[in-house]
């Protein structure tokens, strides 16, 4: 089921999904001056069976020629719930995300793709936050958000992350001295996650991947 809203916005932070749950849709958006090819797909869809997940449909853009506007993809009414825009990031894969059951890896870029990606997330999706360059993380807990639900009501959990300017030294009362890089996840947080759900896989993955995925982006 689709999540009703966007993941929470944290000042001076961006978020990223390590892998995308089956059912996730990615709009086929083209950059200015280009449009979807006629009869082209509106979106890519993460689908799969118990052993393998992959993106159905391919996005293709062609020159608008006389038109100089971006063709916007408008999802069907039931698809309009989640229109999360994320900036295009270089497709780097710290681990093989395709091996994560029920999930797809980041789709590779397509020719003349728009600079931002619009994802339609589904319930159970987890995203991970990092502070933008020039800001550092003060952690009160895990820097992640999960789209949860109960009988049709969906909501993203609040990530426990505050990003502060490099020069600022103020800390929250009772706050431990923050680590220089944003991978620091309290030991108690990872050790108590022993569930057999989709979340366990992603959370364990996050514990091992956060460092590589976030530091790689700064290199």
């Amino acid at each position: 089921e689709l999540c009703d809203d966007d993941p929470p916005e944290i000042p001076h932070a961006t978020f990223k999904a390590m892998a995308y749950k089956e059912g996730t849709m990615l709009n086929c958006e083209c950059k200015r001056g280009f449009r979807r090819i006629k009869s082209g797909s509106l979106y890519m869809l993460c689908t799969g069976n118990s052993s393998h997940s992959s993106w159905d449909n391919q996005c293709q853009c062609t020159s608008s020629a006389t038109r100089n506007t971006t063709k916007q993809v408008t999802p069907q009414p039931e698809e309009q719930k989640e229109r999360k825009t994320t900036e295009m990031q270089s497709p780097m894969q710290p681990v093989d995300q395709a091996s994560l059951p029920g999930h797809c890896r980041e789709p590779p870029p397509w020719e003349n793709e728009a600079t931002e990606r619009i994802y339609h997330f589904v319930v159970g999706q987890m995203v991970y936050y990092q502070c933008v360059q020039g800001y550092r993380a003060l952690h009160r807990g895990p820097a992640e958000s999960v789209c949860k639900m109960t009988h049709g009501k969906t909501r993203w959990t609040q990530p426990q992350l505050i990003c502060t300017g490099e020069m600022e030294t103020s800390q929250f009362p009772g706050e431990e001295k923050p680590q220089a890089s944003p991978e620091g996840r309290p030991e108690s947080e990872t050790s108590c996650l022993v569930t057999t759900t989709d979340f366990q896989i992603q959370t364990e993955m996050a514990a091992t991947m956060e460092t590589s995925i976030f530091t790689t982006e700064y290199q």
Epitope: E1, L2, K21, E22, E78, K81, G102, V123, G124, V146, K148, M149, T150, H151, G152, K153, R155, T157, Q158, C192, L193, V194, T195, T196, T197, D198, F199
Partner: antibody
Framework: EVRLQQSGAELVRSGASVKLSCTAS????????IHWVKQRPEQGLEWIGW????????EYAPKFQGKATMTADTSSNTAHLQLSSLTSEDTAVYYC??????????????WGQGTLVTVSS | DVVMTQTPLSLPVNLGDQASISCRSS???????????LEWYLQKPGQSPKLLIY???NRFSGVPDRFSGSGSGTDFTLKISRVEAEDLGIYYC?????????FGGGTKLEIK
């Protein structure tokens, strides 16, 4: 292993209050909605309400508004149900349950063992 | 509140027989998002309820395929194709599409 462990049976006087607990293991309660359900002796199930432990938001069935108060403590991974101004009508087993969802399921997949509250006059 | 009416109240069966339980809602329980949050639970004596079926017809993991759910709108049915001794207990339907969510009154499946 996912488990919901509820506190022990309570014998309480009419007019008093009682606070029940439901401690989760195997998952973080903040990532789910915790529901409470009442079952009077030899009767059916009644939904009391849910709590979102991540932000404390609650939703109650109208008949339990003012009677039940749900809270949660994410640091101990525990949800609580407080019942006030107890009467004989409140004598029942109270269950906590989690609305669980995955790629191929969604519902009250895990339940606590129940806490019997007996109200004496 | 949406009233969930189960019939019959009691269902005596022979082991190996088919059993059918009906659940009718006082109004449509299609959620505004298009889903129908109709679930079936089994409660055995002295135990907590167990999830059998969610969203009308989907079996929860580990539930034998002799259990099947069907229906739409306001009329729903739980069928057990060949009743086994471990299936005995009280079956409840539940709707989560409207607030407050409500349970049916229960149907007791027992041996003839």
């Amino acid at each position: 292993e996912v488990r919901l462990q509820q506190s022990g049976a309570e014998l309480v006087r009419s007019g008093a209050s009682v606070k029940l607990s439901c401690t989760a293991s195997g998952f973080n309660i903040k990532d789910y909605y915790i529901h409470w359900v009442k079952q009077r002796p030899e009767q059916g199930l009644e939904w009391i309400g849910w709590i979102d432990p991540d932000n404390g938001e609650t939703e109650y069935a109208p008949k339990f508004q003012g009677k039940a108060t749900m809270t949660a403590d994410t640091s101990s991974n525990t949800a609580h149900l407080q019942l006030s101004s107890l009467t004989s009508e409140d004598t029942a087993v109270y269950y906590c349950t989690v609305f669980w969802y995955g790629n191929n399921y969604a519902g009250f997949a895990y339940w606590g063992q129940g806490t019997l509250v007996t109200v004496s006059s | 509140d949406v009233v969930m009416t189960q019939t019959p109240l009691s269902l005596p069966v022979n082991l190996g027989d088919q059993a059918s339980i009906s659940c009718r809602s006082s109004q449509s329980i299609v959620h505004s998002n298009g889903n129908t949050y109709l679930e079936w639970y089994l409660q055995k004596p002295g135990q907590s309820p167990k999830l059998l079926i969610y969203k009308v017809s989907n079996r929860f993991s580990g539930v034998p395929d002799r259990f099947s759910g069907s229906g739409s709108g306001t009329d729903f049915t739980l069928k057990i194709s060949r009743v086994e001794a471990e299936d005995l207990g009280i079956y409840y339907c539940f709707q989560g599409s409207h607030v407050p969510p409500t349970f049916g009154g229960g149907t007791k499946l027992e041996i003839k």
